[in-house]
């Protein structure tokens, strides 16, 4: 889980072990800042929860660029 | 440790409702959903319904659909199965499951509710 | 909805043998959401495998899962005298999240 320590920097110390269907992922942000141990990426998933993931993971650089095509097709 | 206790077991008549509960103890109840699962005597597992509090989403299977409601109440930590119109092939084990709305697997189960309906 | 077809039906083997339960998905399961449980009589089902081939917790390691799209598979290297039940895959990529109807793995 993210956790912000002083807002408004919210920094990842663990990642998740499971990949997450893209099915299942609303949105995300990625964590590049230095008060942060490490690089993350937040995934916001579709029932309200932030999961902390390893950007070096293909399946999680796969679903950023899933959810990055979501926003650039516009809906019908 | 993760508990889900279920209410006692109910006798019915057909054409009335039954509302089952289950409380869930040991875990954050707000960030995982509630499954029902169904089993008449003798067949196999049969997936009614589900709720995600964190969400607000609740799930039917078509075949319940407008005879099951499911809520929850965060307060208690319970959920709740209310299925309408009774009929003897209703007759079954309930049983709640939870689940993780980022996954679905369901890990912990309830000890199940007999409901029978009979005139 | 996704129907799954598990076969055989039922399994007659003895203690120390393998068995070998499939799961058959009416279309692809994305991303292996896949379950297998265990039910014994008058008992509430059981966790055993998520993710087509995570062995949940205390689950043994002689049960095992595996498959991707639509066939998964449950084995069981070498039975014991308690794994003798009804075994149950379930997906759960979308709603409906549809089960098996099931196994039964009995003593021959």
């Known amino acids: 889980q993210p956790d912000a320590i002083n807002a408004p920097v919210t920094c990842c110390y663990n990642f998740t072990n499971r990949k997450i269907s893209v099915q299942r992922l609303a949105s995300y942000r990625r964590i590049t800042s230095s008060k942060c141990p490490k690089e993350a990426v937040i995934f916001k998933t579709i029932v309200a929860k932030e999961i902390c993931a390893d950007p070096k993971q293909k399946w999680v650089q796969d679903s950023m660029d899933h959810l990055d095509k979501q926003i650039q097709t516009p809906k019908p | 440790q993760v508990e889900l206790v279920q209410s006692g077991a109910e006798v019915k008549k057909p054409g009335s409702s039954v509302k089952v509960s289950c409380k869930a103890s040991g875990g954050t109840f707000s960030s995982y959903g509630i499954s029902w699962v169904r089993q008449a005597p003798g067949q196999g597992l049969e997936w009614m319904g589900a709720i995600n509090p964190l969400a607000g989403h609740t799930h039917y299977a078509q075949k319940f659909q407008g005879r099951v409601t499911i809520t929850a109440d965060e307060s208690t930590s319970t959920a709740y199965m209310e299925l309408s119109s009774l009929r003897s092939e209703d007759t079954a084990v309930y049983y709640c499951?939870?689940?993780?709305?980022?996954?679905?697997?369901?890990?912990?189960w309830g000890q199940g509710t007999l409901v029978t309906v009979s005139s | 909805d996704i129907v799954l077809t598990q076969s055989p039906a039922t399994l007659s083997l003895s203690p120390g043998e393998r068995a070998t339960l499939s799961c058959r998905a009416s279309?692809?399961?994305?991303?292996?959401?896949l379950a297998w449980y265990q039910q014994k009589p008058g008992q509430a089902p059981r966790l055993l495998i998520y993710?087509?081939?995570s062995r949940a917790t205390g689950v043994p390691a002689r049960f095992s899962g595996s498959g991707s799209g639509t066939d998964f598979t449950l084995t069981i290297s070498s039975l014991e005298p308690e794994d003798f039940a009804v075994y149950y895959c379930?997906?759960?990529?979308?709603?409906?999240?549809?089960f098996g109807q099931g196994t039964k793995v009995e003593i021959k």
């Open positions: 279309q692809s399961v994305s991303d292996a959401y």
């Open positions: 499951a939870r689940y993780d709305g980022i996954y679905g697997e369901l890990d912990f």
């Open positions: 993710d087509a081939s």
């Open positions: 379930q997906q759960y990529i979308s709603f409906p999240a549809t």
